[in-house]
Interface confidence: medium
């Protein structure tokens, strides 16, 4: 099945290409799949078909749905599907995962970030670029055609980059934004078997019944950008999310890069209102990457009342 996911924000332009390709001379008909209603080709409509392209000028949340395109030639018909989702604009800076285009990697030698889908639009330079919602300023950043070049790339340049441009259609202008993550490959980086700094193996953590307790799992993985590195907690060998105890939650700590350049991660396990049965559980701090997995086990013990006096 030739299907393609497309997404956009309300009140922005969105242009979708039919997943089935054909010669420019072939006609392409578009339909809204749920009603089988034909999409008009007249440009006065807010949503209209233009050959292989389906244009939302601008898009509305109600436009979300599956659109069918049929490429017709004298000898065959090819059918494709465009699964379109239009989202409300976020009030905060955070760009959710479902609005992100594919992640790109860069290094000191190669740091181009292409603006996703821009080739579908009628736009003119310059592009505007933002990182984590902040407009990029400074001589290190150069907007060049449809991509951004970053000079002297550093680890700190990793993040979410948004390109913003104007699509012009018959004299009318529409805004478009697209966001993708940029990760930095450290040319001098290396990875090693995870090293758990805390907790110690078979550590006994004293807790008070009825009070809150925090356990921190901290591990280092090497230097520079790390593939598939993670720290997480398990309860009796089960993922926290699968264990089903709402009092016990894990929360990602701060990404760390120590002065020696090691890449480290924290995961904090928060236990609210500690109960007797929590003392019976086995708490595993897991650190894993491409070299394998290391596990440190922690058990809880009731704080001796005599400790209150010391």
């Amino acid at each position: 099945k030739f299907s393609k996911q497309s997404w956009g924000l309300e009140n922005e332009a969105l242009i979708v290409r039919c997943p089935r390709q054909g010669k420019p001379s072939y006609t392409v008909d578009w339909y809204y799949s749920q009603t089988n209603k034909s999409i008009p080709t007249q440009e006065r409509n807010r949503v209209f078909a233009s050959g292989q392209l389906l244009k939302f000028l601008p898009a509305a949340v109600a436009d979300s749905g599956i659109y069918t395109c049929i490429v017709r030639s004298p000898t065959f018909n090819r059918t494709g599907y465009a699964n379109v989702t239009i989202y409300k604009k976020q009030s905060d800076c955070n760009v959710p995962d479902y609005l992100m285009y594919s992640t790109v990697s860069g290094s000191e030698k190669n740091s181009k970030i292409y603006c996703p889908t821009i080739d579908l639009y009628n736009w003119t330079a310059p592009l505007e670029w933002f990182k984590n919602c902040q407009a990029l300023q400074g001589s290190r950043y150069r907007a060049h055609k449809s991509f951004l070049v970053i000079d002297n790339v550093m680890t700190e340049d990793a993040g979410d980059y948004t390109c913003k441009f104007i699509h012009n259609e018959n004299g009318a202008n529409y805004s478009v934004t697209a966001t993708r993550s940029f990760t930095v490959k450290d040319e001098q980086g290396f990875s090693l078997f995870p090293v758990i700094g805390a907790p110690a193996q078979n550590e006994i953590k004293e807790v008070e019944i009825g009070k809150n307790a925090n356990l921190t799992c901290s591990a280092c993985f090497g230097k520079g950008t790390q593939f598939l590195a993670a720290v997480l907690w398990q309860l009796n060998g089960t993922k926290i999310t699968d264990f089903g105890e709402p009092r016990i939650q894990q929360e990602e700590g701060q990404n760390q890069s120590f002065s020696n350049g090691l890449a480290c991660l924290d995961m904090v396990l928060r236990i609210a209102d500690v109960k007797e049965e929590d003392l019976l559980l086995q708490y595993d701090c897991l650190a894993l990457n491409l070299h394998g997995l290391r596990r440190h086990t922690v058990r809880l013990s009731r704080k001796n009342p005599i400790d209150h006096h010391s």
Epitope: Y101, S102, S181
Partner: nanobody
């Protein structure tokens, strides 16, 4: 949260082949990396192979180099592990994993696993 579903496991004779698939749904597939881990009975989970879905660079554990091949199809949101010349010591539950990097806010997830048994 990204959901991962593995398939393709089963019983195979030594020297045989299997192809494992890992389909991702519910999130952005083109995160930084996908990989396969395995866990044999009574042993710790170990890394087998991984691939950067954004750049295509791969990693293999020494024990599977030359026999296993990892690949990813971004258009299908799926990663594959082609396993050739299988040995009895490859018997394990194979888990698919997806994750970002330390400098990327995406979460690490793994699937429920698919059992591979190599036996005559």
């Amino acid at each position: 949260e990204v959901q991962l579903v593995e398939s393709g496991g089963g019983l195979v004779q030594p020297g045989g082949s299997l192809r494992l698939s890992c389909a991702a749904s519910g999130g952005t597939f083109s995160v930084y990396a996908m990989g396969w881990f395995r866990q044999a009975p009574g042993k710790e989970r170990e890394a087998v192979a991984s691939i950067s879905t954004s750049g295509g660079s791969t990693y293999y554990a020494d024990s599977v180099k030359g026999r296993f091949t990892i690949s990813a199809d971004n258009s299908k949101n799926t990663a594959y592990l082609q396993m050739n010349s299988l040995k009895p010591e490859d018997t394990a539950v194979y888990y698919c994993a997806i994750g970002g990097t330390l400098y990327d806010r995406r979460r690490f997830e793994w699937g429920q696993g698919t059992l591979v048994t190599v036996s005559s």
